[in-house]
Amino acid sequence: IWELKKDVYVVELDWYPDAPGEMVVLTCDTPEEDGITWTLDQSSEVLGSGKTLTIQVKEFGDAGQYTCHKGGEVLSHSLLLLHKKEDGIWSTDILKDQKEPKNKTFLRCEAKNYSGRFTCWWLTTISTDLTFSVKSSRGSSDPQGVTCGAATLSAERVRGDNKEYEYSVECQEDSACPAAEESLPIEVMVDAVHKLKYENYTSSFFIRDIIKPDPPKNLQLKPLKNSRQVEVSWEYPDTWSTPHSYFSLTFCVQVQGKSKREKKDRVFTDKTSATVICRKNASISVRAQDRYYSSSWSEWASVPCS
Amino acid sequence: RNLPVATPDPGMFPCLHHSQNLLRAVSNMLQKARQTLEFYPCTSEEIDHEDITKDKTSTVEACLPLELTKNESCLNSRETSFITNGSCLASRKTSFMMALCLSSIYEDLKMYQVEFKTMNAKLLMDPKRQIFLDQNMLAVIDELMQALNFNSETVPQKSSLEEPDFYKTKIKLCILLHAFRIRAVTIDRVMSYLNAS
């Protein structure tokens, strides 16, 4: 058993049928010695008396808010949550496996640049009685500071019969140098509580590996005289690290017909312009990627050919 | 990347061209190592990230772009020098700061070259003959060092009398390649910045 926060405790249980559970001793936070009784949640049934209460915690029915009273007055509370260990592996019931980029990916994180700011998000099908708290650091043995905001519900989607909820959080490394070579990964830890179930999820990454630039901005077409060709030009996104000559991007320019089946023409360039043939009803799209470290491509920025 | 990209005229800034070749070569070598050593801990998540140049060179700090010298987090490790206008060409006057940056890059390359050559000698003794260093990568390191055109004492190749532990050697190779790839990215950024200056 360990304390998650004031008056909230997590009991770790080896979870299997007929498991013996864990013996827990609760102590009433009071100078009083006599006349103390204990109840669980809203029930008025007295579970025991005295300054301490010993309970055997086996199932969720044994978890909840234990309260000690004296003469009708509440003295203190202890909320017991359960953390299930199933065959040596902590349960992952609360969050959905996003399966990207690999199986057992519960937290996904992205950064738009090398400033030390990043966003993480996760999915769940649970809509109520759900709380998250996020902590982060650079390295784990001698952790350096990363400040995270509160997790917020960022999207709701309908997936078949189920509703899916996306939560996200923004974090900022306290002292980040965009040019630094990372040797210690960022660690992100999410505590999730659903009703009386506690779970924790972690992700470890280097900012360089989660970079995904914003799409190029100001995408424009300039027709070339007496030709089907057009000059496509664009600019680095505002959110990208500067100076651009140091933090360079490379670009992929794509000409795509109306039908998804039509052949796509693609050109790769380090410049911020390219000459392509514009077909009728086609659209031109450009995306960006760090020129020197191949992390994710940005989303496409698009303009119609017409 | 799927398609090759046109590089600037090498005569204009030869170091840029060589640094791009270096990054390509080390990335290919790392990919090959990860595939060949699939039963060894060779991924970024599994290895310890060690920097053999730590406390010996200061490439990141010495080559910091002028724009980032205002960022206190980039200056916290030492009195940092930063690069100003200049190029890799001997015919142009390079500033003291830039010379410091380029000599730091040269020292990095020299240290990695010695490590890789020592490691290759060990890998050649492996009866499994599982993996060797790409000669192209070693050649590209050499070419960039020549283009940087610094003279420094030659570091003797380390020789070891004890029987090599091939498992440890292969893990060390992965660690070295990961670190060298990161340094090659920094070198490429620096050369690109200098080229634009």
Epitope: K85, G88, K102 | -
Partner: antibody, heavy 115, light 112 residues
Framework: QVQLVQSGGGVVQPGRSLRLSCAAS????????MHWVRQAPGKGLEWVAF????????YYADSVKGRFTISRDNSKNTLYLQMKSLRAEDTAVYYC????????WGQGTMVTVSS | SYVLTQPPSVSGTPGQRVTISCSGG????????VKWYQQLPGTAPKLLIY???QRPSGVPDRFSGSKSGTSASLAITGVQAEDEADYYC????????????FGTGTKVTVLG
């Protein structure tokens, strides 16, 4: 004490269907994940499928994906394995099993796929 | 498609020490616990060892488990005639959990 009693095995022709049941008693069935494991005659153990305690997630071996469906009825304390498009290579003793560091197995039920 | 490899058979005379190996990889045994089962002819498997080296109550202490790196082993010190059975190791793969990974199985024969 924990008990898992299996039923539903038998002889079936290739291409036909069969449904196995596993009735649980002696524990809170709705709190635990469950597996199906099979063993072809003279061969080793092969995992078939898993279902979470609340039925929200199901996992299958590649060899049965798209043909077998694991399900549970927590109000009846029963686990099921619906087997469709059966093949000769599905011939085996099928076991249900609880998920956890200490597990409990059913007695096994024989499924024979033969024409 | 067994990822955990066991010797097909091992044998020993009563009182001898018998060991069975179970070889896997970094993503299974290397990062998860190992279990061992005993299966007597015509019966369901019985749990002998969980959590690499833990014995459930009721399992004789002549059975012991251990794990090192990407391999695990089961030792029977002072093998007895009633130990003649098939033995299976089991673990998980970190990418496919909760799918159970079973070993190929080992037939233990008690001679004499």
């Amino acid at each position: 004490q924990v008990q898992l009693v299996q039923s539903g095995g038998g002889v079936v022709q290739p291409g036909r269907s069969l449904r196995l049941s596993c009735a649980a008693s002696g524990f809170t069935f709705s709190s635990y994940g469950m597996h199906w494991v099979r063993q072809a005659p003279g061969k080793g153990l092969e995992w078939v499928a898993f279902i979470r305690y609340d039925g929200s997630n199901k996992y299958y071996a590649d060899s049965v994906k798209g043909r077998f469906t694991i399900s549970r009825d927590n109000s009846k304390n029963t686990l099921y394995l619906q087997m469709k498009s059966l093949r000769a290579e599905d011939t085996a003793v099928y076991y249900c099993k609880t998920h956890g560091s200490h597990d409990n197995w059913g007695q096994g039920t024989m499924v024979t796929v033969s024409s | 498609s067994y990822v955990l490899t066991q010797p097909p058979s091992v044998s020993g005379t009563p009182g001898q020490r018998v060991t069975i190996s179970c070889s896997g990889g970094r993503s299974n045994i290397g990062s998860n616990y190992v279990k061992w089962y005993q299966q007597l002819p015509g019966t369901a498997p019985k749990l002998l060892i969980y959590g690499n080296d833990q014995r459930p109550s009721g399992v004789p202490d002549r059975f012991s488990g251990s794990k090192s790196g990407t391999s695990a082993s089961l030792a029977i010190t002072g093998v007895q005639a009633e130990d003649e059975a098939d033995y299976y190791c089991q673990s998980y793969d970190r990418g496919t959990h909760p799918a159970l990974l079973f070993g190929t199985g080992t037939k233990v024969t008690v001679l004499g």
